[in-house]
């Protein structure tokens, strides 16, 4: 009984198509597969960013796989051939591992890369990223931002930089069609006549960095002698009402502060007839239905009601928030 053996895949490599972190892992079938013509060979692929404790594992019949990586670090991957038990009289056979690595040769010292990179997707409409220059870089240093997401043919450079003292310190992005719910890759590199500048890579999903506009049209309605309903409206824009959570701050007679987080555009407050003044503000955030994370909006304009009218049936005063 001869032991069944199989070779590892050939020409295993990591290919960088220039998508700022979205890489292709590809390979060719192993040599000497003639004995297993009737068999469907599978491959077990393991890969990770160097320094990560866990490997991602994929079993596939294909000769390629694509995924996103952090190009600030190196990447390591290994693959072996699997022969299913149907091909080998009852036991799965594995080849030895083929291994490969990939990294971008770093230029410049780490301190030269941009600091405090911050990106916000305002009202799910306008993406703005800002950064600070690296430590100790000279004024002749300039930074350039490139970005890519699935759907673009190639990485694009920012065309509308925010500048300070002649240096690029941010980017206003154009309209980004079909760009949410997928990884968005950014590279900020730099150039200087005096010393090389280290590149920085960032990956996020746009729906998770949305900062909405504040709610508008805050109103009061007395429901009963001891209940007042607070209402507001969602701001103009592409975000539907079901995507919002709200935080309310209510102040009664300059003393009691009530805070609450709610899902709808109303909140019912228990009050007494003694209440003389009522003020509230609201802010909004994209909720778990539409994102994994988000940024609270600014607080709305404050809406107050004072005096005798508070005990009457309806208190309604529109107050438009100006942008």
């Amino acid at each position: 009984d001869t032991e069944i053996k199989v070779n590892p895949p050939q020409d295993f490599e990591i290919v960088d198509p220039g998508y700022l972190g979205y890489l292709y892992l590809q390979w060719q079938p192993p040599l000497s597969l003639d004995h297993f013509k009737e068999c469907t060979v599978e491959y077990e692929l393991k890969y990770r960013n160097i320094g990560s404790e866990t490997w991602k594992t994929i079993i596939t019949k294909n000769l390629h796989y694509k995924d996103g990586f952090d190009l600030n670090k190196g990447i390591e991957a290994k693959i072996h051939t699997l022969l299913p038990w149907q091909c080998t009289n009852g036991s799965e056979v594995q080849s030895s591992w083929a291994e490969t690595t990939y990294w971008i040769s770093p230029q410049g010292i780490p301190e030269t890369k941009v600091q405090d990179m911050d990106c916000v997707y305002y009202n799910w409409q306008y993406l703005l990223c800002s950064w600070k220059p690296g430590i100790g870089v000279l004024l002749d240093t300039n930074y350039n931002l490139f970005y890519w997401y699935e759907g673009l043919d190639h990485a694009l450079q920012c065309v509308d930089y925010i500048k300070a003292d002649g240096q690029n310190i941010g980017c206003r992005f154009p309209y980004l069609e079909a760009s949410d719910y997928k990884d968005f890759y950014i590279c900020v590199n730099g150039s200087s006549e005096n010393k090389p500048i280290r590149s920085s890579y960032f990956t996020f999903q746009l729906q998770n960095i949305v900062k909405p506009l504040p709610p508008v049209y805050l109103t009061f309605t007395r429901e009963s002698s001891c209940e007042i309903k607070l209402k507001w409206s969602i701001p103009l824009g592409p975000i539907p009402a079901r995507c919002f959570d709200y935080e309310i701050e209510i102040r009664e007679d300059d003393t009691t502060l009530v805070t609450a987080t709610v899902e709808n555009e109303t909140y019912t407050l228990k009050t007494t007839n003694e209440t003389r003044q009522l003020c509230f503000v609201v802010r909004s955030k994209v909720n778990i239905y539409c994102s994994d994370d988000g940024i609270w909006s600014e607080w709305s304009d404050k809406q107050c009601w004072e005096g005798e009218d508070l005990s009457k049936k309806t208190l309604l005063r529109h107050h438009h928030h100006h942008h």
Partner: nanobody, 115 residues
Framework: QVQLQESGGGLVQPGGSLRLSCAAS????????MGWYRQAPGKQRERVAG???????VYAASVEGRFTISRDNAKNTGYLQMNNLKPEDTAVYYC?????????WGQGTQVTVSS
């Protein structure tokens, strides 16, 4: 037409446990969040727990530490594990799957906590 079907409700004694399931008939879980709501007689419907597409969770203060929400995108199913149940947890429990484009509700499953 996408449908959500809750199951797992029933009668349980105080201190007991139940696990609710919410199965979707279509592939709507991928980028949508999922939530569990409840409505007791004469009360407003309230969100008990929610989970985003990436697995971030939120809980109502009244169930924090007792209820756990989870999801299995491959099976298009969400779950609510309810431990240490109290009489005040008695309600009809509804699941919801929603996102920027979608908003679907189940028909509800009755949970009764009584000795």
């Amino acid at each position: 037409q996408v449908q959500l079907q809750e199951s797992g409700g029933g009668l349980v004694q105080p201190g007991g446990s139940l696990r609710l399931s919410c199965a979707a008939s279509g592939s709507i879980f991928n980028t949508n969040g999922m939530g569990w709501y409840r409505q007791a007689p004469g009360k407003q419907r309230e969100r008990v727990a929610g989970i985003s597409s990436g697995g971030n969770t939120v809980y109502a203060a009244s169930v924090e530490g007792r209820f756990t929400i989870s999801r299995d995108n491959a099976k298009n199913t969400g779950y609510l594990q309810m431990n240490n149940l109290k009489p005040e947890d008695t309600a009809v429990y509804y699941c919801r799957v929603a996102g920027r484009q979608d908003d679907y509700w189940g028909q509800g499953t009755q949970v009764t906590v009584s000795s």
